[in-house]
Interface confidence: medium
């Protein structure tokens, strides 16, 4: 049998059964999540569940820019350092940078400091680029 690789919407990139869209727009975390959802297909801000997935995403984004952090779908909605993925994925893989998690920082970004391979927490009302993800 011929197994067809699923196709992503135009402009989105495919990796291991998921489609990703990197949006070079400045949005706060909740507006970014709403915009991801608006593209349909069950898209949300991206969950990153393995080092391989993180590396593929980081390589893709580095082709566009290397200086601006990017919102992902990890947040702390209860503000108790109980982080969860907005798409419901299990919070098992972690890639936090060594920075303090304190203050009013309850949303996660891919940090440009380590080529987008590590995460930092940031204030959710900051306006940043964002990464969406869906399963085709």
């Amino acid at each position: 049998d011929i197994i067809m690789r699923p196709s992503c919407a135009p402009g989105w990139f495919y990796h291991k059964s998921n489609c990703y869209g990197y949006f070079r727009k400045l949005r706060n975390w909740s507006d970014a999540e709403l915009e991801c959802q608006s593209y349909g297909n069950g898209a949300h801000l991206a969950s990153i569940l393995s080092l391989k997935e993180a590396s593929t995403i980081a390589e893709y984004i580095s082709g566009y820019q290397r200086s601006q952090p990017i919102w992902i779908g990890l947040h702390d909605p209860q503000k108790r350092q109980q982080w969860q993925w907005i798409d419901g994925a299990m919070y098992l893989y972690r890639s936090w940078s060594g920075k303090s998690m304190g203050g009013n920082k309850h949303c996660a970004e891919m940090s440009s400091n380590n080529n987008f391979l590590t995460w930092s927490s940031n204030e959710c009302n900051k306006r940043q680029h964002f990464l969406c993800k869906y399963r085709p």
Epitope: G11, G21, Y22, F23, R24, K25, L26, S67, Q68
Partner: antibody, heavy 124, light 110 residues
Framework: EVQLLESGGGLVQPGGSLRLSCAAS????????MSWVRQAPGKGLEWVSA????????YYADSVKGRFTISRDNSKNTLYLQMNSLRAEDTAVYYC?????????????????WGKGTMVTVSS | QTVVIQEPSFSVSPGGTVTLTCGLS?????????PSWYQQTPGQAPRTLIY???TRSSGVPDRFSGSILGNKAALTITGAQADDESDYYC??????????FGGGTKLTVL
């Protein structure tokens, strides 16, 4: 090649009216927002007005609001600026500029191509 | 009324480096203002140099670069040349379809 050519400038008395035109070529005119920017003699640049690609949304600087009207005719690839109740302080070179706004993937918000300008003089 | 502030004039030696800045009368400039920079020589239309803080427009030499320095947008010219002598304007997008130009910086290459 993108080209923007302004016309319609000239000498007008205070309180008078003038309509500027900007003929665009080399790109799909209706796909781009457009703007007018002016420069008084010996002074800096000042943003005046902008209009969406469809013409449905318009924006104005406070200094011209209620006196100037921006419009476009996409079938003629032409941008307009209707200027009423002109004042001496409206004397300037008026530039037409293509405006990069939002796409699905990216926000821009800058002026990427400029015309050579047309001079408007308001004097009695 | 938001005022965008630039140095009125600046001079640089040929081959030298100069950084022009663009600030706000109240508050800090960040990438969320989408700073852009334009070069204008006397009697000519402006030319787009930098947009989205740090992206060079096509055909602009890489000696021109944009950044955020502290609470201002900045345009740095590395290895200044005689024909860089011009007026330089920054523009900030305030949102809701409103753009504000700075007063411009007259750059002299001595």
């Amino acid at each position: 090649e993108v080209q923007l050519l302004e016309s319609g400038g000239g000498l007008v008395q205070p309180g008078g009216s003038l309509r500027l035109s900007c003929a665009a070529s080399g790109f799909t005119f209706s796909s781009y927002a457009m703007s007018w920017v002016r420069q008084a003699p010996g002074k800096g640049l000042e943003w005046v007005s902008a209009i969406s690609g469809s013409g449905g949304t318009t924006y104005y600087a406070d200094s011209v609001k209620g006196r100037f009207t921006i419009s476009r005719d996409n079938s003629k690839n032409t941008l307009y600026l209707q200027m009423n109740s002109l004042r001496a302080e409206d004397t300037a070179v008026y530039y037409c500029a293509r405006l990069r706004g939002s796409t699905r993937w990216e926000d821009f918000y800058y002026f990427d191509y400029w015309g050579k300008g047309t001079m408007v003089t308001v004097s009695s | 009324q938001t005022v965008v502030i630039q140095e009125p004039s600046f001079s640089v030696s040929p081959g030298g480096t100069v950084t022009l800045t663009c600030g706000l009368s109240s508050g800090s400039v960040s990438t969320t203002y989408y700073p852009s920079w334009y070069q204008q020589t006397p009697g000519q239309a402006p030319r787009t140099l930098i947009y989205n803080t740090n992206t060079r427009s096509s055909g602009v030499p890489d000696r021109f670069s944009g950044s955020i320095l502290g609470n201002k947008a900045a345009l740095t010219i590395t290895g200044a040349q005689a024909d860089d002598e011009s007026d330089y304007y920054c523009v900030l997008y305030l949102g809701s379809g409103i753009w504000v130009f700075g007063g411009g910086t007259k750059l002299t290459v001595l």
